[in-house]
C-alpha cells in the first residue's frame, strides 16, 4: 500500500522480529484464582519481538511511522508487535447464580503485526 | 473485563502515558512526492508514550500481558501503544489516467490504546 | 452442535503402532481451554484417560502410557489424532475422543471405534 | 494416581423410586478454590458415555433436574430422585483434580 511495500523476512535474525510464542500460565499468575475454575493452567500466546523497517506492517499508518522512526527516532517511536487476530478461549468460571462456561474472543492472541 | 480494570490516569506524570500526538511531514518525509500531489504537507496523527500497568488497556489479552509482564519482564513486553481507531484521509495523487481523489482508511490515527 | 467422529483401522497387528483421527465439525478445533482428549475402554471394562492436546500443540500423557503415546493436532483439517506404538493384546479397546475443559467437563464423545490387537 | 472406588457394583431399581450411588477418592478432591473437582458420566448400553455433573454438584447443560451429585473431600454420591427407564446404563465417577483424572470402576443400574 502507499508505495510503502511490508516485508516478511526478518532483517535481525531468527526469532527476533515479532512473532508469536506461548507462555504458560497459572490461574494464580493472572490473579484469577478466585474466579476461574478451569483451566487451572492457560497456554497463552502472545506476540513478541521487534519491529524493524517494514517487517510484518499492519497497515499504512505503521508503514508511515516505521518511516518517520528512521527520520525523527526521538519523537516517533518505532511500530510495535501486538496481536492481529485473535483465538478463543473456553473458561469455566464462577457465576452469582453457580458455574458457567463463557468463550472469550479477545484473551489468547493468533497472528501478529506491527502497529 | 476479567478482573482486571483498565484505568485512564496516567501515574508517570502528564504526557508520559500513551496519547494522541499529531506530526507534520512532508511528502518527501514519506518518499511519496512522486505519486501525492495534495496535500504536500500532512499532519499525521500518531499514538505514542508509555503503557504502564492497566493503563488504557485494549482488551482483555493486554490485561494478561501487563500482568505477565510484572511477573515474568525478560520474557513478556509490556503492553505498548497502538492506534484503536483512525480517521480517514483524503489525498490526490497521480493514477495512469491522470489525477484522481483517494480516501485512506488507515494512515491517521484517531484514538489509542495499550495492546 | 459440536460433534466428533473417530477413524482408523479396526485391526492392528502386534507391536505395530495402532493410528486414530479424530474429525472435528460444527466448531473450531482452535479454541483455547479446550483439551482434545482420548480415553479407551477395554472390552467390558472401566473407562482410562489416555491423554490429550490444546490447539497450540502441548500435549498431556497418562504416564501409564507415555512412552508409547503420540498426540498431534492439525488445525487446518480440525483433526486430532492418537499414534500408540507396540502394542499388544491389553491394548485391545473401544477409543473415544472427546472434548475436555483440562481434564474434565467431557461434554462431546466421539462414537468410539473398536480397536482389536491380533496376528 | 488417585484411585477412584464406587458402591455398589450393580443397583437394580424400580421405575419411580430413588436411586443414591457412593463414588470414594484415595485422597480429597477439595482444591482450594472451594470446589470439589469430581465428575459424573453415564454410559447408556452400546452408547459413548455422556457427561451428567461436573465440580461435584453441577449439572451438565441438558441434563435433568432428578440427577444431583453432592459430598465434598473424599465422600461422593449420585443421586437420581425418581428413576426413568432410560435412566439404566453404568455411571462412573472421574476425579479431575490432578492428571491423569482416573475413573472409578463403574455402578451398573438397571431395572429390577
Known amino acids: 500500500s502507499a508505495h510503502l511495500h511490508p516485508r516478511d523476512s526478518c532483517p535481525l535474525g531468527p526469532g527476533r522480529c515479532c512473532h508469536l510464542e506461548t507462555v504458560q500460565a497459572t490461574l494464580e499468575d493472572l490473579g484469577w484464582s478466585d474466579w476461574v475454575l478451569s483451566p487451572r493452567q492457560l497456554q497463552l500466546s502472545m506476540c513478541v519481538g521487534e519491529c524493524p523497517h517494514l517487517y510484518r506492517s499492519a497497515n499504512t499508518h505503521a508503514l508511515i511511522k516505521a518511516r518517520l522512526h528512521g527520520l525523527q527516532p526521538d519523537r516517533v517511536p518505532a511500530p510495535c508487535c501486538v496481536p492481529s487476530s485473535y483465538t478463543p478461549v473456553v473458561l469455566m468460571h464462577r457465576t452469582d447464580s453457580g458455574v458457567s462456561l463463557q468463550t472469550y474472543d479477545d484473551l489468547v492472541a493468533q497472528g501478529c503485526h506491527c502497529a | 473485563s476479567a478482573h482486571l480494570h483498565p484505568r485512564d490516569s496516567c501515574p508517570l506524570g502528564p504526557g508520559r502515558c500513551c496519547h494522541l500526538e499529531t506530526v507534520q511531514a512532508t511528502l518527501e518525509d514519506l518518499g511519496w512526492s512522486d505519486w501525492v500531489l495534495s496535500p504536500r504537507q500532512l499532519q499525521l496523527s500518531m499514538c505514542v508514550g508509555e503503557c504502564p500497568h492497566l493503563y488504557r488497556s485494549a482488551n482483555t489479552h493486554a490485561l494478561i500481558k501487563a500482568r505477565l509482564h510484572g511477573l515474568q519482564p525478560d520474557r513478556v513486553p509490556a503492553p505498548c501503544c497502538v492506534p484503536s481507531s483512525y480517521t480517514p484521509v483524503v489525498l490526490m495523487h497521480r493514477t495512469d489516467s491522470g489525477v484522481s481523489l483517494q480516501t485512506y482508511d488507515d494512515l491517521v490515527a484517531q484514538g489509542c490504546h495499550c495492546a | 452442535q459440536v460433534q466428533l467422529q473417530e477413524s482408523g483401522p479396526g485391526l492392528v497387528k502386534p507391536s505395530q503402532t495402532l493410528s486414530l483421527t479424530c474429525t472435528v465439525s460444527?466448531?473450531?478445533?482452535?479454541?483455547?481451554?479446550?483439551?482434545w482428549t482420548w480415553i479407551r475402554q477395554h472390552p467390558g471394562k472401566g473407562l482410562e484417560w489416555i491423554g490429550a492436546?490444546?490447539?497450540?500443540?502441548?500435549?498431556y500423557y497418562n504416564p501409564s502410557l507415555k512412552s508409547r503415546v503420540t498426540i498431534s493436532v492439525d488445525t487446518s483439517k480440525n483433526q486430532f489424532s492418537l499414534k500408540l506404538s507396540s502394542v499388544t493384546a491389553a491394548d485391545t479397546a473401544v477409543y473415544y475422543c472427546?472434548?475436555?475443559?483440562?481434564?474434565?467437563?467431557?461434554?462431546?464423545w466421539g462414537q468410539g471405534t473398536l480397536v482389536t490387537v491380533s496376528s | 494416581d488417585i484411585v477412584m472406588t464406587q458402591s455398589p457394583l450393580s443397583l437394580p431399581v424400580t421405575p419411580g423410586e430413588p436411586a443414591s450411588i457412593s463414588c470414594r477418592s484415595s485422597?480429597?478432591?477439595?482444591?482450594?478454590?472451594?470446589?470439589?473437582?469430581l465428575d459424573w458420566y453415564l454410559q447408556k448400553p452400546g452408547q459413548s458415555p455422556q457427561l451428567l455433573i461436573y465440580l461435584g454438584s453441577n449439572r451438565a447443560s441438558g441434563v435433568p433436574d432428578r440427577f444431583s451429585g453432592s459430598g465434598s473431600g473424599t465422600d461422593f454420591t449420585l443421586k437420581i430422585s425418581r428413576v426413568e427407564a432410560e435412566d439404566v446404563g453404568v455411571y462412573y465417577c472421574m476425579q479431575t483434580l490432578e492428571a491423569p483424572p482416573t475413573f472409578g470402576g463403574g455402578t451398573k443400574v438397571e431395572i429390577k
Open positions: 492436546i490444546a490447539y497450540s500443540g502441548s500435549t
Open positions: 472427546a472434548r475436555g475443559i483440562e481434564y474434565q467437563h467431557f461434554d462431546y
Open positions: 460444527g466448531g473450531s478445533i482452535s479454541s483455547g481451554g479446550i483439551y
Open positions: 485422597q480429597s478432591l477439595l482444591h482450594s478454590n472451594g470446589y470439589n473437582y
